[in-house]
Structure formats: C-alpha cells, structure tokens
C-alpha cells in the first residue's frame, strides 16, 4: 500500500513539475521587435512606426501578438518595456532641411476598450547637426515597468523617421513579463 | 495509515519546495561587470574592452563566467542585456586632438561553435566637444532582450576608449536571465 | 483508501499551487515612481529629488515603501533598477543663466545600518544650449542589476532640477526584483 502511494505520488509530482514549469514559461510573454527598414515613413513630425520584424534576426515574439504596427498584450501582467532608437545622417545622403533637429521617441499604450492613447515613456534630444561634420549619429534608450492588460497595444512614435538607422542592433523595442497582477 | 501518508507527503512536499526554490535560483544566472580602469586600451576606432571587475564593488556574477574579456553564457535562456558607458574629458586630461567625436558602444555576441560575431545592440552619439568648455561628459545606455545559448560570449566594444569614465557607477554592463527557452 | 488519498492529495496540491503562486508574487517587489512636478527644487548643482508619485498615473509600488523621498527596500534580493530623466528649456521660460550645462542623474543607495551613500549608476551629458534655438531637450536613461538588502534606500539626484520635464512619461525611476539572494 505504502509503496503504491509513494509511486503514485512521484508520478503526480512529476506531472506537477512539468505543469509548473510549463505554466511558468507561459506566464512569461516577451517580444523584441527590430525596425523594418524597407518601410520607414518620411516626415519630420511625430510619426508612428508600424513596420517591425518579429521573426528574423534578433526579432522574436512569444505569447504576445504583433499586428498593424502594434505589439498586442495577450496576458495581463507587469512588463518591462524598452526601446532603443538610433538616428544618423551622412553628408552623402544630401543636405538636411535644418541643422536644428528634435530627435524623439514616444512609447505609447492604446486601450481598445476605452479608445485612448497614452505615452508611457519618452526620450530624446534636440541636436545641432552642423555641416562642418560629415557624419552625425544619436541614440535614445528608454525603459520602464508597466501594468499591461490583455488587449492593450504598445506602439512607437518618433520624430524625423527618415533619419532612423535601419540596423536591427540600432532601432528596436521590446517587452517581457516580469510578474502577474495580484 | 492516513496520518502516516500526510506526514510523508509534507516531508516530500517540503523537499520539493526546497528543490523548486533552488532550481529557480539556479535558473537565473546574472552578471554586472564594472570597468577595470587600470587597463583601458588606447585607440580611436572600435576597440574591445577586455578588463572588467566581477567580484568587487558593484561587480558580481552568478552562473555565468567571465573569461578573456568576455561574459560567457553557461545556461540557455532569454536574457536581458544592458550596458552603460560614460565618456568624459577635462582640460587637464590631455591634449584632445579633435572636437568632433564619435562616442559609441557595441554589445556583441560571439558563438564559438560557428566562429562569428554579431552586434546585438549599439548606441552613442557624435559630439562636438569644444575647447570653450573645460569639462565634457556623455553617457550611453542600451538594453534589450535576447536568446542566448550556452557557450555564447558577450563582449563590449567602444570607440575612443581613452575617454571612458573609469568609475564603477559610470561604465558597466550586465545580463540577467528572465526565462528558459521553450 | 486509495481514492481518499488521491482526493486529499489533490486538495493539498491545490493549496500548494496557491501558496507557490502567492509566494512568487510576494517575492517580486516593484516600484515605478514618477516625478511630482509641484515640488521640484531649484539650483544647478547636485540636488536630491524627494517628491515622486507612487499611486497615480503610471506610478505604482508593491512590497517596497516610499518615504521621505526615498524608495525603501523591504525584501532582500537582486533588483533591476532604472531611471529616465528628461530636461528641457523653452525660450519662453526665460533666459538660461549659462549656455553650458551639465545635465546629470545619479542613482544612489543609502544604508541606514552603516550611514553611507553610494552611487550605483550615473549618466548624463554636458550640453551647449545656445540662444539660437527656441527649444532644447535632453533625456538620460540608466539601468543596472544590483543586490539590495531590506532597509536600504534608493534615491535620485540630478543637476539643474529646474530644467526637469515634469511629465510622468519623461522623468521617473523604478525597480523590480528579479531573484532572491542565494
């Protein structure tokens, strides 16, 4: 009897371990999205970036959805969100319209239930990119910890999108779930 | 009989709890490495920084290895990687040859199995550090979420290494495991 | 007998799952604190920022305490700490005292047991904010992984606090626990 119970217990505990491990993984959605350089919009004002890779190079996604240029939360939780945005200009690209630039990123959250958009994080700098230098570069990094609900969407807006560095190591954003909501 | 089973179960569950707790800890490698100022290389182009502290001040490492200037992954997983790099110049530091500087960081991943190096993240800025000011400073921060395999190596490259701020709160990089690979 | 044991085991395992889930949540303190713009100090030198929101907008806190302008650790562990600090100036705000600015952030840890303060992370830039431009902006982001003990306090110091951007998406800091101390 006792031996049978022990064996049964071990079996149940084994499956419990699998279940715990599996549920732990499922409890941790993430995404790392890299810029799709073939589809960067023009303009100097605030523009939403809608083209990102989620399945090539460093791009990846799990238990989240990428749709219509937005990263969609599938699971309630507290997430660490981050973005790295690089801007560059070389004199061979032609003259800049202005030497005084506002290079900015805005990480926004949109709720479909209550159609509204809120900026979670912003960063950037005003820059003077003078003609005395043949090359200019600038990067912004932002990150923060936010409560996200299933269905909410994260998107990235930037100024001067035509100056974006199209490399996957330069312009990207992401999220990973850290913990459940109590 | 029933009492005996209860006692035995508590005992087994107790050890399961220990095991779960222990395995959770072991599943979370991390490192925070701070610059070793006594061994900063010279050069103006991209230079690999190989001297970091992992066991003094804020420097620490667990379930990862630091060897030959590289942070070695011992355990497959998804990791959050970050770097903070500070550059500075004071008029007493030396004869700065140019006002136009490219201050950059590159976080690279090297696979030994397939000898190749890839940049995961980059950041920085071109700067104009004029002689009209006696002190100049600039910091870069990058961070992102990456899949790393056991044996892969993370290293840091910078431009203008002689301008690095040698403080442990200024120039550092690190990683921590967030979750397993499915 | 065997059926009764199975039922009992399921019940015990169920509560174990609740306990595990609950203890996991309790093992993950976090905070995201946003600047309280009604109480920003003046000055151009290093100033401690003591007014932050922890319960409105993006501000939130759990299993940590905010008191006297400091974020207090209630639970030993390894934490990821971050800060995003934005500075801005518009010509309508009046003339700057100087065009040469040092815009800096320092994330400090204070131990009450051993009354001492140490800088964990710093970042920033010297800037030339010339009168040729009507608007200036600059953001700093820092982040890193640190061992924190219960009772230790995290605070934020900045230079030129009067130039801080008072938006909750602009100037904030935070922490979340990643793992226990072995």
């Amino acid at each position: 009897g006792s031996q049978h119970i022990r064996a049964e217990k071990a079996m149940v505990d084994g499956s419990w371990l699998d279940l715990a491990k599996r549920s732990k993984l499922e409890a941790q959605p993430f995404a790392h999205l890299t810029i799709n350089a073939t589809d960067i919009p023009s303009g100097s004002h605030k523009v939403s970036l809608s083209s990102w890779y989620h399945d090539r190079g460093w791009g990846k996604i799990s238990n989240m959805t990428f749709s219509n240029g937005k990263l969609i939360v599938n699971q309630d939780g507290f997430y660490y969100l981050y973005a790295n945005i690089c801007f560059r200009h070389h004199e061979t690209s032609g003259d800049l319209a202005t030497e005084y630039l506002q290079l900015m990123v805005y990480v926004t959250k949109t709720s479909i239930k209550i159609p509204s958009s809120h900026t979670l994080m912003k960063g950037g700098s005003t820059k003077y990119w003078s003609g005395n230098s043949e090359f200019h570069f600038y990067s912004i990094n932002v990150g923060g910890f936010f409560k996200l609900r299933s269905g909410e969407e994260i998107s990235i807006e930037v100024s001067n999108p035509s100056l974006l560095d199209p490399d996957q190591d330069a312009t990207y954003f992401g999220a990973f779930k850290v913990r459940d909501i109590d | 009989g029933s009492q005996h089973i209860r006692a035995e179960k508590a005992m087994v569950d107790g050890s399961w709890l220990d095991l779960a707790k222990r395995s959770k800890l072991e599943a979370q490698p991390f490192a925070h490495l701070t610059i070793n100022a006594t061994d900063i290389p010279s050069g103006s182009h991209k230079v690999s920084l190989s001297s970091w502290y992992h066991d003094r001040g804020w420097g620490k490492i667990s379930n990862m290895t630091f060897s030959n200037g590289k942070l070695i992954v011992n355990q497959d997983g998804f990791y959050y990687l970050y770097a903070n790099i500070c550059f500075r110049h004071h008029e007493t530091s030396g004869d700065l040859a140019t006002e136009y500087l490219q201050l950059m960081v590159y976080v690279t991943k090297t696979s030994i199995k397939i000898p190749s190096s890839h940049t995961l993240m980059k950041g920085g800025s071109t700067k104009y550090w004029s002689g009209n000011s006696e002190f100049h400073f600039y910091s870069i921060n990058v961070g992102g979420f990456f899949k790393l395999r056991s044996g892969e190596e993370i290293s840091i490259e910078v431009s203008n290494p002689s301008l690095l701020d040698p403080d442990q709160d200024a120039t550092y990089f690190g990683a921590f495991k967030v979750r397993d690979i499915d | 007998g065997s059926q009764h044991i199975r039922a009992e085991k399921a019940m015990v395992d169920g509560s174990w799952l609740d306990l595990a889930k609950r203890s996991k949540l309790e093992a993950q303190p976090f905070a995201h604190l946003t600047i309280n713009a009604t109480d920003i100090p003046s000055g151009s030198h290093k100033v401690s920022l003591s007014s932050w929101y922890h319960d409105r907008g993006w501000g939130k806190i759990s299993n940590m305490t905010f008191s006297n302008g400091k974020l207090i650790v209630n639970q030993d562990g390894f934490y990821y700490l971050y800060a995003n600090i934005c500075f801005r100036h518009h010509e309508t705000s009046g003339d700057l005292a100087t065009e040469y600015l040092q815009l800096m952030v320092y994330v400090t840890k204070t131990s009450i047991k051993i009354p001492s303060s140490h800088t964990l992370m710093k970042g920033g830039s010297t800037k030339y904010w010339s009168g040729n431009s009507e608007f200036h902006f600059y953001s700093i982001n820092v982040g890193g992984f640190f061992k924190l003990r219960s009772g230790e306090e995290i605070s934020i110091e900045v230079s030129n606090p009067s130039l801080l951007d008072p938006d909750q998406d602009a100037t904030y800091f935070g922490a979340f626990k990643v793992r226990d101390i072995d």
Epitope: - | S42, G43, S44, D95, A97, T98, E99, S130, G131 | -
Partner: antibody, heavy 122, light 107 residues
Framework: EVQLVESGGGLVKPGGSLRLSCAAS????????MSWVRQAPGKGLEWVSG????????YYPDTVKGRFTISRDNAKNSLYLQMNSLRAEDTAVYYC???????????????WGKGTTVTVSS | DIQMTQSPSSLSASVGDRVTITCKAS??????IAWYQQKPGKAPKLLIY???YRYTGVPSRFSGSGSGTDFTFTISSLQPEDIATYYC?????????FGGGTKVEIK
C-alpha cells in the same frame, strides 16, 4: 597628393615677431589636428605647438607658452604660427606636421612639410 | 615632461646587416612610441607608431617593439637608402618629446 607647404620664415631680431603659414592640400584639412615642430641647426626635433581639428584647443610646451600662438582657418586650409618675443634659441627650421588619426589624446605625425627657416639674430 | 634617451647616437653598419636602435622613456609610456626617419635636408617620415605598427607604405624590414619604458627599433637588413637619422617620439602625454636621434651610416 597630400601636401603641406610652409612659408613666412626669415631673419628677425631678438624680441621681434614673425608669422608662419602652412598651406594644406590633398586631404580634408578640417578633420585633422595639426602641429608645428622645429629643428635647431644640427639638433634634434622639438614639438612647439598643436591645435585641434576644429581650432578650439591649442597646446604648447613651456618653452614657448605665452610667446607663440597657433591658429587655423579651415575654410582656407591653412595653419598659422604667430611668434612673438623671439629669442636666439628659437632659431630653427619650422615644420608644419599633420597629426595622424589615432587615440584622441596621442599625437604623432604622418605628414610633414619641407620646413621654413627662422633665424633670430641681432 | 617625459625625457626620451636614444642610443647609440650614431652607428655604422654594412648593407644587409641587422641594425637595432633603443629608446628609453623616463616614465611608463605603455606602447605610445613612434619612430621617424630623416634624411639630410629633408623632413622626417613616420615609420612606426604605437611601438610596433608600421605606417602605410613602410617596408617590412622596419619594425618596432617594446612597452613601458624600453623600446627597440630594428632594420632587419640594412639597405643603402636607409642612411638617415632615426628619431623616437613618445605620444603618451603632452608635451610630445623626441629622442636625440641616431645617425645610421654605411661602413
């Protein structure tokens, strides 16, 4: 062809002044720090001044500090050395030299002019 | 200021000989040493920088080594066109200082 051509040398009395010029061609002058290096007759080389690529940093050894002033005009691809309160020991061939790219704090010289002779004598 | 002491001040060698010149710095300069060649009546030419890196177009018979305070410049096989005075320079800290020179002649 990368070239540096010095001019302005000559004979001057002690206490007098002289302005040397160096015309640069064949490279993007504004990208390089520049220096003046002199060589007294039958002696070795002595660095006498340096200027950053943008012209906002100037450097001198103690032997000439306060007497010599280095400057540049990037629009004209030109480097200058204004020498005041000249002494007999300033007699030398003065070379204009381009600092090679390298560590921002380290100066060595990859392109040199042919030199111009300065003689300080009463 | 960092003093650079070069030796010998002059030497005579045959074509094909291995020629070695040494330079000693008065303090540690890591590997921040350059070597120049100056022919009579001409401007100096950069041969080596950062102790051991040959400048573009410099023949492979010229090499440099050393770190800290002791440095060596070598011509592996002396050629007639190598007749010149050779100078070391520290590029570690300002003011930039040169050695006294080594005059190389053919026997």
């Amino acid at each position: 062809e990368v070239q540096l051509v010095e001019s302005g040398g000559g004979l001057v009395k002690p206490g007098g002044s002289l302005r040397l010029s160096c015309a640069a061609s064949g490279f993007t002058f504004r990208n390089y720090a520049m220096s003046w290096v002199r060589q007294a007759p039958g002696k070795g080389l002595e660095w006498v001044s340096g200027i950053s690529s943008g012209g906002t940093y100037t450097y001198y050894p103690d032997t000439v500090k306060g007497r010599f002033t280095i400057s540049r005009d990037n629009a004209k691809n030109s480097l200058y050395l204004q020498m005041n309160s000249l002494r007999a020991e300033d007699t030398a061939v003065y070379y204009c030299a381009r600092r090679d790219y390298g560590d921002v704090y380290e100066w060595y010289f990859d392109v040199w002019g042919k030199g111009t002779t300065v003689t300080v004598s009463s | 200021d960092i003093q650079m002491t070069q030796s010998p001040s002059s030497l005579s060698a045959s074509v094909g000989d291995r020629v070695t010149i040494t330079c000693k710095a008065s303090q540690d300069v890591r590997t921040s040493i350059a070597w120049y060649q100056q022919k009579p009546g001409k401007a100096p030419k950069l041969l080596i920088y950062s102790a051991s890196y040959r400048y573009t177009g410099v023949p492979s018979r010229f090499s440099g080594s050393g770190s800290g305070t002791d440095f060596t410049f070598t011509i592996s096989s002396l050629q007639p066109e190598d007749i010149a005075t050779y100078y070391c320079q520290q590029h570690y800290s300002s003011p930039w200082t040169f050695g006294g020179g080594t005059k190389v002649e053919i026997k």
